[in-house]
């Protein structure tokens, strides 16, 4: 922003009525009147170029400083060319000196040169030669100087002539202010420019109505430079929640719009599934049946709990069940769907039912599932199981109703036995197996089927009540295919994998261990 000038003294505007002091009195500087454009103009002039040593002073009236710290002095003047005088006037000069003196009171006509401090020698850029003067075409020079810091109540300026032909047409003394400013929704007051050129005066701004400094943001500050210019803005204000920036002010959000925090963004239209908001709204309330989770941004549509998983199947595999489902048809407008699986078991004989979380094993924790399948194992044969799969999202906790689907399955078969080779010799294989403890009581016997690898025409069967068997009378260094199956009162359980076990070759017959 451009600096503002506050004038303390304006000779040209005073119409010759300032009554400046000349020294020596009646010699040297003289107030003259001229007509220009039918208007009287006043000037102080001096032209003692032929008279040798000159020391003519012109002192302004006492000027009250007020709040100025640095003053600017603008001079408009003409200087005649020394060569335009007869003989070149050996004592003729083409410059004059500018002085100032500070004081707390007006000395009146008491003029003392020693109190004055030289500001500068003022030299013209252009001198007025004879031909210009005769054609009444004078060359006007403009020079500006500044002085500061000033500390007393007022000051004088003085002009010393040392033998020039000078006409002083304008003396304007002013100081500069940084003007009142609205920037970044902050108001900065009119501020007096500082006196030191390198330093900048720091000025705190105040936020306009309904604007605030954002959390963690810097307070608005600007720097007022010596020339009255605002520089280096720091920090800013933002329109508070419920208000948006319109030009240099904060205006309340229109009905149907909202703004949930202090930010540069405009008010946003209320999202889907919300009620129309009043003026100046910071959020929009949800429609009946729709909700906003605590972590949901106000800009997100209101959502609702999902519908139940769309399709649920329970596939029995021995003593395991694989549960599979598809996502709800209605996600409630959210993507944070998770599933929870619960289990109930019922004894067919008594019809008695109860939870079975403690006795079954899930392939992964059954709550907060993101996948759409889970395997449940360690199920007991001849038991009825009901599995419930519930779909939940971020707003499910805000309602009491639940969205779930159930599937029932009867376990009729035992889990396949896990078979191990415990030992071997040239003519025997010692085989053991295991099944989950809950199923063991249901098993009547185990059937071990074995045959030579490559001989698919004949096979042998052994039955046992235990969990191991030694198969004898086998050929050395021969691979046998072995399978174990549980037999229950109701029939066959699931068969194990077909395993390949090899007897020792005769040269390794000393070793019975695996």
């Amino acid at each position: 922003a451009q600096g503002k000038e506050v004038v303390l003294l304006d000779f040209a505007a005073a119409g010759g009525e300032l009554g400046w002091l000349t020294h020596p009195y009646g010699k040297g500087w003289d107030l003259m009147q001229n007509i220009m454009n039918d208007m009287p103009i006043y000037m102080y002039s001096v032209c003692n170029v032929m008279s040798g040593d000159q020391d003519n002073w012109l002192r302004t009236n006492w000027v009250y400083r007020g709040e100025a710290e640095r003053i600017f002095i603008e001079l408009k003047f003409t200087v005649r060319d020394c060569n335009s005088f007869p003989g070149g006037a050996s004592s003729c000069k083409e410059t004059f000196n500018l002085y100032y003196a500070e004081s707390d009171l007006d000395y009146g006509t008491n003029f003392q040169k020693r109190l004055f401090t030289k500001i500068d020698t003022i030299a013209p850029d252009e001198i007025t030669v004879s031909s210009d003067f005769e054609a009444r075409h004078v060359k006007l020079n403009v020079e500006e100087r500044s002085v500061g810091p000033l500390t007393r109540k007022g000051f004088y300026l003085a002009f010393q002539d040392i033998g020039a032909c000078v006409a002083l047409l304008s003396v304007r003394v002013y100081y500069k202010k940084c003007p009142e400013l609205l920037q970044g929704l902050a108001h900065f007051p009119e501020t007096i420019a500082g006196s030191d050129a390198p330093s900048l005066a720091t000025v705190a701004g105040t936020c306009v109505d309904h604007a605030v400094v954002p959390p963690g943001g810097e307070e608005p500050r600007m720097h007022c430079a010596v020339d009255g210019e605002w520089l280096v803005p720091i920090g800013q204000c933002l329109c508070q929640a419920g208000y948006e920036k319109v030009e240099d002010a904060c205006q309340a959000c229109s009905p149907g719009f909202f703004k949930f925090e202090a930010s540069e963004s405009p008010c946003l239209e209320c999202p889907e599934h919300t009620l129309p908001s009043p003026e100046g709204a910071t959020s929009c309330e949800c429609e009946e049946g729709f909700f906003r989770a605590p972590q949901d941004p106000a800009s997100m549509p209101c959502t609702r709990p999902p519908s139940a998983p769309h399709y649920l199947t329970a596939v029995g595999m021995g003593a395991k069940v694989e549960l599979r489902w598809t996502p709800p048809q209605d996600s409630g407008g959210r993507e944070d769907i998770v599933y929870s699986v619960t289990c109930e078991q019922c004894w067919p004989e008594s019809g008695e039912c109860g939870p079975c979380e403690a006795s079954v094993r899930y392939s992964e924790p059954p709550h907060g599932l993101t996948r759409t399948s889970v395997t449940v194992s360690d199920l007991e044969p001849h038991m009825n199981y009901t599995f419930t799969v519930e779909a939940r999202n971020g707003v499910s906790g805000l309602v009491t109703s639940r969205s779930f689907r159930t599937a029932s399955v009867s376990i009729n078969q035992t889990e396949p036995p896990k078979v191990r080779l415990e030992g071997r010799s040239t003519t025997s294989l010692s085989v053991s197996w295991s099944i989950p403890p809950p199923q063991q009581s249901r098993v009547w016997k185990y059937e071990v089927t074995y045959r030579k690898k490559g001989d698919s025409n004949s096979y042998n069967v052994r039955r046992t009540e235990g969990f191991s068997v030694t198969l004898d009378d086998l050929a050395p260094d021969t691979t046998y295919l072995v399978q174990v199956q549980a037999l229950t009162q109701e029939g066959q359980g699931a068969g194990s994998k077909v395993h390949e076990f090899q007897t020792l070759s005769p040269e390794g017959s000393g070793n019975l261990a695996v």
């Epitope: 071997r424 698919s456 399978q483 068969g495 076990f501 007897t503």
Partner: antibody, heavy 130, light 108 residues
Framework: QVQLQQWGAGLLKPSETLSLTCAVY????????WSWIRQPPGKGLEWIGE??????????NYNPSLKSRVTISVDTSKNQFSLKLSSVTAADTAVYYC?????????????????????WGQGTMVTVAS | SYVLTQPPSVSVAPGQTARITCGGN??????VHWYQQKPGQAPVLVVY???DRPSGIPEQFSGSNSGNTATLTISRVEAGDEADYYC???????????FGGGTKLTVL
């Protein structure tokens, strides 16, 4: 880490014999059954056969549909095994792969016939055209 | 000879779960292995012995096998999972390796 590098003629005329070799780098050559598998363009995988060399004996096993034309042999000094397929026709046009099973064939009496193939050669495209 | 039956194609949206089946008589008594094959590349083993994963294969690949059906499950499917998938068993009656016909997985 075992690596398989395979090579052989890529363009044959009908009735010629296809010949491919697979070199095994790293690992114990005699502990595994080494297989050849092929894949006609745009079709699925077909197992051709396998070989294992233990002691001084080669144990071979071939896909019945190719058995009459296939020979798989080994050169234990170079840790290489080879495939020969005679009397080729356009139907034998395929990418041919050599492959290593995940586990040694038998360990402490537990054997793994038809084990999963965990390492494959880079494949050789063989085209049969007159 | 033993036959493994796979669906020719399966399509699934990103982030969803893909299930590829492999049917065979009493396949539950056999160890089933699964391979992924991308165009122009050799197959890569992703699951062996029904449900075990080789090192370096992500948890999203899992398998199960019971009765007459083995299943490869790929959870949280990504575009990079688009490939052909093959199942494989050893037929103990004929002593031969058998591959399924393959399933093309398309990620929508």
């Amino acid at each position: 880490q075992v690596q398989l590098q395979q090579w052989g003629a890529g363009l044959l005329k009908p009735s010629e014999t296809l010949s491919l070799t697979c070199a095994v780098y790293g690992g114990s050559f005699s502990d595994y059954y080494w297989s050849w598998i092929r894949q006609p363009p745009g079709k699925g995988l077909e197992w051709i056969g396998e070989i294992n060399h233990r002691g001084s004996i080669n144990y071979n096993n071939y896909n019945p549909s190719l058995k009459s034309r296939v020979t798989i042999s080994v050169d234990t000094s170079k840790n290489q095994f080879s495939l020969k397929l005679s009397s080729v026709t356009a139907a034998d046009t395929a990418v041919y792969y050599c492959a290593k099973p995940l586990r040694p064939h038998c360990t402490n009496g537990v054997c793994y016939s038809g084990d999963a193939f965990d390492i494959w050669g880079q494949g050789t495209m063989v085209t049969v055209a007159s | 000879s033993y036959v493994l039956t796979q669906p020719p194609s399966v399509s699934v949206a990103p982030g969803q779960t893909a299930r590829i089946t492999c049917g065979g008589n009493n396949i539950g008594s056999m160890n089933v292995h699964w391979y992924q094959q991308k165009p122009g590349q050799a197959p890569v083993l992703v699951v062996y012995d029904d449900s075990d994963r080789p090192s370096g294969i992500p948890e999203q690949f899992s398998g199960s096998n019971s009765g007459n059906t083995a299943t490869l499950t790929i959870s949280r499917v990504e575009a990079g999972d688009e490939a052909d998938y093959y199942c494989q068993v050893w037929d103990h009656s004929s002593d031969h390796v058998v591959f399924g016909g393959g399933t093309k997985l398309t990620v929508l």
